[in-house]
Interface confidence: low
């Protein structure tokens, strides 16, 4: 066990805190919850601080909870290839480039790492080049998530790891606004990281409302586990 | 200083409900996660449930959940503990512990500030 795994055998509180603009609209956004690494579960309220918020919730999802990457399930024969609970507790910085298909682009930057007993996301996001009346700043987006498949590989050179995948937007007139997310996660510390061999994380998560809850709000539920990666052939044979 | 006063304990039958109630004083309510914590005769102090600061996140201890219910009302700086279905077996000190935190935890030493208890027997 590394010893940052040893931080995430239990429940862990989260806290997500995002300044974001895009084109030009400021806004802030702050989640709390907790996160469950045994299971890869993630339980989320994000509340808009600023309003309304001037993005649809489910181009940000990959910002806030594939943020907390940390969280994900790795089964015993994958733990050595996880880097992201290595990292902790003093963190990592994660970057991404999206790319909107036919619209513009988001660039974030966060550091993820725990603050006393709380794994906290604080990220800056920066949008440019939307269409007013495109997908997103149109709001034309279903309040819903696909599952998909994050693909991981070692990036020897920054001692991290480069991420890479497609996230699928539904769109209310029944097509699909394509999001393409090139992540780089690199260490805080200088103490050593797991760098993993090649392989991903599947994801699923549900998007609902808090009944009670009357500003701009997304309420949270994913699950995350690691796969890609057979037990070695001595396994087999046991 | 903090203060947190507990108030709402009694005798029940099984069965019946309560509500405890816990006053804060003395601070920035609004930036404390709160706990419930209870201690019967002989027993070590247990978690009971807690509520995040900003009233978003609630969790409990397995053999109350669905029974208890942890609300926080910020403009009241009240934490309360609805105590539904009560069994015998529930009968203990009802403790509210503060921590200036996003989130409750189970731990009893992360908490600054406790309440002097409420007596509540089933």
């Known amino acids: 066990m590394s010893k940052g795994e040893e931080l995430f055998t239990g429940v862990v509180p989260i806290l997500v805190e995002l300044d974001g603009d895009v084109n030009g609209h400021k806004f802030s956004v702050s989640g709390e919850g907790e996160g469950d690494a045994t299971y890869g579960k993630l339980t989320l309220k994000f509340i808009c601080t600023t309003g309304k918020l001037p993005v649809p919730w489910p181009t940000l999802v990959t910002t806030f909870s594939y943020g907390v990457q940390c969280f994900s399930r790795y089964p015993d024969h994958m733990k050595q290839h996880d880097f992201f609970k290595s990292a902790m507790p003093e963190g990592y910085v994660q970057e991404r480039t999206i790319f909107f298909k036919d619209d513009g682009n988001y660039k974030t930057r966060a550091e993820v790492k725990f603050e006393g007993d709380t794994l906290v996301n604080r990220i800056e996001l920066k949008g440019i080049d939307f269409k007013e009346d495109g997908n997103i700043l149109g709001h034309k987006l279903e309040y819903n998530y696909n599952s998909h498949n994050v693909y991981i590989m070692a990036d020897k050179q920054k001692n991290g790891i480069k991420v890479n995948f497609k996230i699928r937007h539904n769109i209310e007139d029944g097509s699909v606004q394509l999001a393409d997310h090139y992540q780089q996660n690199t260490p805080i510390g200088d103490g050593p990281v797991l760098l993993p061999d090649n392989h991903y994380l599947s994801t699923q998560s549900a998007l609902s409302k808090d009944p009670n809850e009357k500003r701009d709000h997304m309420v949270l539920l994913e699950f995350v586990t690691a796969a890609g990666i057979t037990h070695g052939m001595d396994e087999l044979y046991k | 200083q903090v203060q947190l006063v507990e108030s709402g304990g009694g005798l029940v039958q099984a069965g019946d409900s309560l509500q405890l109630s816990c006053a804060f004083s003395?601070?920035?309510?609004?930036?404390?996660?709160m706990g419930w914590f209870r201690q019967a005769p002989g027993k070590e102090r247990e978690f009971v449930g807690g509520i995040s600061r900003s009233g978003a996140t609630t969790n409990y201890e397995d053999s109350v959940k669905g029974r208890f219910t942890i609300s926080k009302d910020n403009t009241k700086n009240t934490v309360y503990l609805q105590l539904n279905s009560l069994k015998p077996e529930d009968t203990a000190v009802y403790y509210c512990?503060?921590?200036?935190?996003?989130?409750?935890?189970?731990?009893?030493?992360?908490?600054?500030?406790w309440g002097q208890g409420t007596q509540v027997t089933v």
């Open positions: 512990a503060a921590r200036n935190n996003i989130l409750p935890v189970t731990t009893i030493d992360k908490y600054e500030y």
């Open positions: 003395g601070g920035t309510f609004s930036t404390y996660a």
